[in-house]
Amino acid sequence: KLTIESTPFNVAEGKEVLLLVHNLPQHLFGYSWYKGERVDGNRQIIGYVIGTQQATPGPAYSGREIIYPNASLLIQNIIQNDTGFYTLHVIKSDLVNEEATGQFRVYPELPKPSISSNNSKPVEDKDAVAFTCEPETQDATYLWWVNNQSLPVSPRLQLSNGNRTLTLFNVTRNDTASYKCETQNPVSARRSDSVILNVLYGPDAPTISPLNTSYRSGENLNLSCHAASNPPAQYSWFVNGTFQQSTQELFIPNITVNNSGSYTCQAHNSDTGLNRTTVTTITVYAEPPKPFITSNNSNPVEDEDAVALTCEPEIQNTTYLWWVNNQSLPVSPRLQLSNDNRTLTLLSVTRNDVGPYECGIQNELSVDHSDPVILNVLYGPDDPTISPSYTYYRPGVNLSLSCHAASNPPAQYSWLIDGNIQQHTQELFISNITEKNSGLYTCQANNSASGHSRTTVKTITVSAELPKPSISSNNSKPVEDKDAVAFTCEPEAQNTTYLWWVNGQSLPVSPRLQLSNGNRTLTLFNVTRNDARAYVCGIQNSVSANRSDPVTLDVLYGPDTPIISPPDSSYLSGANLNLSCHSASNPSPQYSWRINGIPQQHTQVLFIAKITPNNNGTYACFVSNLATGRNNSIVKSITVSASGTSPGLSAGA
């Protein structure tokens, strides 16, 4: 069937519309378009003869129409008057006619709307505001936006006049927002510019800051007042009821006790005509003196002396406070406070007691801190350490040893070789050493203040031949699946290569084996019983090589789940029951038995002569390894039958 489709159906003024023809018959002579719902020669727009491809305008032709060979009609620059029906008249070659009607609607392109308001400065909780969207346009829909969101649901918001007017009743400061209106019709949508609603409000009750109401004599008083208000409030200050100044801030330098009193801030809004006040009471206290700390011993000796720190001056009815390292006092038996907290005593001082220490005097409104005091604790010297840690050197190299001991004041150092004093320096340097430089090297550290001395002796061997190495271990009895073991090849020697063997083989590749410290240390992580092997380390340089004696790792493991033998579980009455329990374990485990939950004997073998059906039950073997701290057990059910009642039963032992 012949049909007409309007594309688009809703057309904007000034745009184009295409009346598209569907199902056009074959073998046509021509066709004609008419304005309206019927064929009317006076309302013919255009005709088209297919044979000549000639378009002929009719009485209703406006110069804006184009007819296509497929009978579709394009109308340009649409005007409001074009709205309505259009009829296509098709003339077939057999001169039989066919008609179809289509239609479209024309809408204006909407202008950009604007918002008018009946009240540009409404007062909070008093006024209403009516916004109207201009201009009034036929067939247009009106929408409103607040802060680019659709209108919230509120009993104070009312739409009227076909949604063209938005009324806000009893405006509040929260209605201060961006308002936009939008006009829509089927062909266009336009949004207005924002209108910001300026709601007059306040002043609210002012707030005075800071909230602090207690001050010390000599301080500056700086009060600030703020009240929510639109337009911003005008402020006035009153002290004890007397007007001071019309400012938002009140500043009084170097206050005295006489400045105590009631301070009032008044906020005024000239547009709303409202006033609000807030009062705060200020108290000014006399200034106490700044405390300081005295000490009965300025250079105490570690582990020997006590120190008493006293907070000065002494003031009656005053609370004294103490801080160490900017923290309140820790609980310690070495710290003692006097009854009035004024004196802090440190019993048997250590090097960690240096401080700083502060004391404080608490008054009505604050705490006054003393300057910090640091204790000069004399300590040491500790046992000196000689570095580097090498004990073996080759001839011809330089020997450079350094000594250090923790000490206050810093230690004075002396070096001795084989008991003979060499020099009073922290470092000892001997160039181009020979075998004759082998010997005992002693570093002596002396603290002149405490009078204490400490020494460390190191054996230095100078030899072209490497010594026989030895293996030291950090764990002689590691527990399986728990401990790690670090083997170290001694001694530490310069320019030396370290090698390792396990059971006479080079080290296997394993994620549990790790070499470190220039291959001098071999670490076994998460040891297993299979790691109980012979470990040998070797050292070599360009002229010699040597191997250590083997060290066998004693891995503690188990006990594993025990096994009860024999495996039989059925016995004849009168037989002997002889059960043996075994569990893999290092060291060997302790064994115990329970029959039907009742403890029996602490042996590996359980023997019961001439059993009867009364010996039926559960037989449990418990194993315990005191070294690993682990336990294990197994349960076996034993059935004893009366003689001759059941074939195939064990005769027992």
């Epitope: 184009e16 255009i46 110069g63 804006r64 296509y68 340009q76 620059n77």
Partner: nanobody, 119 residues
Framework: EVQLVESGGGLVQPGGSLRLSCAAS????????IGWVRRAPGKEEELVAA????????RYADSVKGRFTISADTSKNTAYLQMNSLRAEDTAVYYC????????????WGQGTTVTVSS
């Protein structure tokens, strides 16, 4: 009655210029698109230029771009085609037509005016 009357054709040497006029009656050219169509023997009809006053734009066939200029005087309800740098291949009968603003289609009327480019 709707009428389109073309004028301004004639004989011109290659490289020369001509100005064609299209006087419209029975409708306002400011409401539609006016185009110039040319027909030459053995060649396809070609819409060489169109002007849509109500849309504010003009368009040209690639073959005449930079040489032809279409314009309209709405007070006289007349459209013009200024033809410069004419070539022998521009020889044709030029018709004034109602053109589509959305494609290359048109309906034409009138007698047309002949343009001959020859030395």
């Amino acid at each position: 009655e709707v009428q389109l009357v073309e004028s301004g054709g004639g004989l011109v040497q290659p490289g020369g210029s001509l100005r064609l006029s299209c006087a419209a009656s029975g409708f306002n050219i400011k409401d539609t698109c006016i185009g110039w169509v040319r027909r030459a023997p053995g060649k396809e009809e070609e819409l060489v230029a169109a002007i849509c006053e109500y849309k504010g734009y003009t368009r040209y066939a690639d073959s005449v771009k930079g040489r032809f200029t279409i314009s309209a005087d709405t007070s006289k309800n007349t459209a013009y085609l200024q033809m410069n740098s004419l070539r022998a291949e521009d020889t044709a009968v030029y018709y004034c037509a109602i053109a589509s603003p959305v494609d290359q289609y048109y309906n034409y009327w009138g007698q047309g005016t002949t343009v001959t480019v020859s030395s």
